[in-house]
Interface confidence: low
């Protein structure tokens, strides 16, 4: 079987190997990499290029969100002949080059993952010596960050007609299922999940009418774990007190 594209089978990890005349620019990245929040992830990226034995200045760049225009999260530069790519930008100090760009490897390590890192990343290399050329992955690699649930806010708010309602917001990936339990609610009342617009990892559940004083508990659960938080409702003289 032969691909309709040119098959690049030179050893990308050995700079002594001559590129074939037909060698072209290409980037090899996986469609997706998964890791848990708090852990580290490797974003693999290797490339081929048509410039035989290029050893001039080069810059390696990773950007997030969209190709060509997304914000840079990592950038390093290697001087002519040097295998050391000196870091010029590492967002929050969490991005570290694992690969050697001189050996056609731009693989990146992302430390201390957060849910906000869940996006698509694009690698790019720029030659700037006798040869001026550049190439960037168009589809990139999607970093999928998973996380156990964490309740980020729980509160009791007044609602019309001297009633009270409770709100619980949690984050996690997969998005957690939320359930309320409390006085006169029975063991557990599953609430409708409603991911907030623009906040794909945040889920909010509302308990619209708190009819009894006491402790109301919100439980958030997904395949990675569960989390609980409580509020207390005490009504005296038309006022409420809530504590978590």
């Amino acid at each position: 079987f032969v691909r309709t594209k040119i098959d690049t089978t030179e050893n990308l990890l050995n700079t002594e190997v001559h590129s074939s005349p037909a060698q072209r620019w290409s980037m090899q990245v996986p469609p997706e990499v998964s890791a848990e929040a708090g852990d580290a992830a490797v974003l693999p990226c290797t490339f081929t290029h048509p410039h035989r034995h290029y050893d001039g200045p080069l810059t390696a760049i990773w950007r997030a969100g969209e190709p060509y225009a997304g914000p840079q999260v990592f950038r390093c530069a290697a001087a002519r002949g040097s295998e050391l790519c000196q870091t010029a930008l590492s967002l929050h100090g969490r991005f570290r080059l694992l690969g050697n760009p001189r050996r056609n490897d731009l693989s990146l390590r992302v430390e201390r993952l957060a849910l906000a890192d869940d996006r698509r990343y694009f690698c790019r290399v720029e030659f700037a010596g006798d040869v001026h050329d550049r190439y960037e992955s168009r589809h990139g690699v999607r970093l999928h960050v998973t996380a156990a649930p964490r309740i980020v806010n729980i509160s009791v708010l007044p609602s019309p007609a001297h009633a009270f309602r409770a709100l619980c917001t949690a984050e996690g990936e997969p998005p957690p299922a939320l359930a309320w339990s409390g006085p006169a609610l029975g063991n557990s009342l599953a609430a409708v999940r409603s991911p907030r617009e623009g906040h794909g990892h945040l889920v909010t559940a509302e308990l619209p009418a708190l009819t009894h004083d006491g402790r109301y508990t919100c439980t958030a659960a997904n395949s990675l774990g569960r989390s609980e938080a409580s509020v207390y409702l005490f009504r005296f003289h038309g006022a409420s007190g809530a504590s978590t």
């Epitope: 098959d7 990308l12 469609p31 693989s107």
Partner: antibody
Framework: QVQLQQSGAELVRPGTSVQMSCKAA????????IGWVKQRPGHGLEWVGD????????NNNEKFRGKATLTADTSSNTAYMQLRGLTSDDSAIYYC???????????????WGQGTSVTVSS | QIVLSQSPALLSASPGEKVTMTCRAS?????MYWYQQKPGSSPKPWIY???NLTSGVPARFSGSGSGTSYSLTISRVEAEDAATYFC?????????FGGGSKLEIR
């Protein structure tokens, strides 16, 4: 030409482990991912995971977490898959395949091994 | 995970007929990939990125579709086309395959 040669059929006892191999030839082993696919009659094809020998990075199907371990030996151009805690559900043909992630997003398993048949029986 | 449902599971055609098999995804995918498998053999890559034929695949095969609905069409079936065809997505992990469409030639 590109070839992936897989190890021979295995007949194993429940609860034991098995390791199968996939020897690559005809291309630069460290440039491409090697994927593993499970096929059971009536169950179609199932992706187990893949490994990039050049940077020793693996992608895994969560379903096979704790079941399958992927490794690669660049000195012998060989990828390995170990299956542990075998049950009858693990009886299947397991294929290795070279995975070509093209620059324009055209991903494909372009070359396949002949498959290793695993039968779990007491 | 993205579930791929292929239909029909079994289809029978006479040489020269036009045949279409479909693959529906439970969520939208960017591209669809197709593999051909004959009994006792490994799967072979057949169509990549929805509509591109891999080298050596006869021009009577074509692929099309977008979003959640994709299809593989054979304009004039020949005896050598008898096989099972699997669709596959690379859009989201875990990469998944359809259950297959088996083509028999009468």
């Amino acid at each position: 030409q590109v070839q992936l040669q897989q190890s021979g059929a295995e007949l194993v006892r429940p609860g034991t482990s098995v390791q199968m191999s996939c020897k690559a030839a005809g291309y630069t082993f460290t440039n491409y991912w090697i994927g593993w696919v499970k096929q059971r009659p009536g169950h179609g094809l199932e992706w187990v995971g893949d490994i990039h020998p050049g940077i020793n990075y693996t992608n895994n199907n969560e379903k096979f977490r704790g079941k399958a371990t992927l490794t690669a030996d660049t000195s012998s151009n060989t990828a390995y898959m170990q299956l542990r805690g075998l049950t009858s559900d693990d009886s299947a043909i397991y294929y290795c395949a070279r995975v070509d992630y093209d620059y324009d997003g055209s991903y494909i398993m372009d070359y396949w091994g002949q498959g290793t048949s695993v039968t779990v029986s007491s | 995970q993205i579930v791929l449902s292929q239909s029909p599971a079994l289809l029978s055609a006479s040489p020269g007929e036009k045949v279409t098999m479909t693959c529906r995804a439970s969520s939208s995918v960017s591209y669809m990939y197709w593999y051909q498998q004959k009994p006792g053999s490994s799967p072979k890559p057949w169509i990549y990125a929805t509509s591109n034929l891999t080298s050596g695949v006869p021009a009577r095969f074509s692929g099309s579709g977008s979003g959640t609905s994709y299809s593989l069409t054979i304009s004039r079936v020949e005896a050598e086309d008898a096989a099972t065809y699997f669709c596959q997505q690379w859009n989201s992990k875990p990469w998944t395959f359809g259950g297959g469409s088996k083509l028999e030639i009468r």
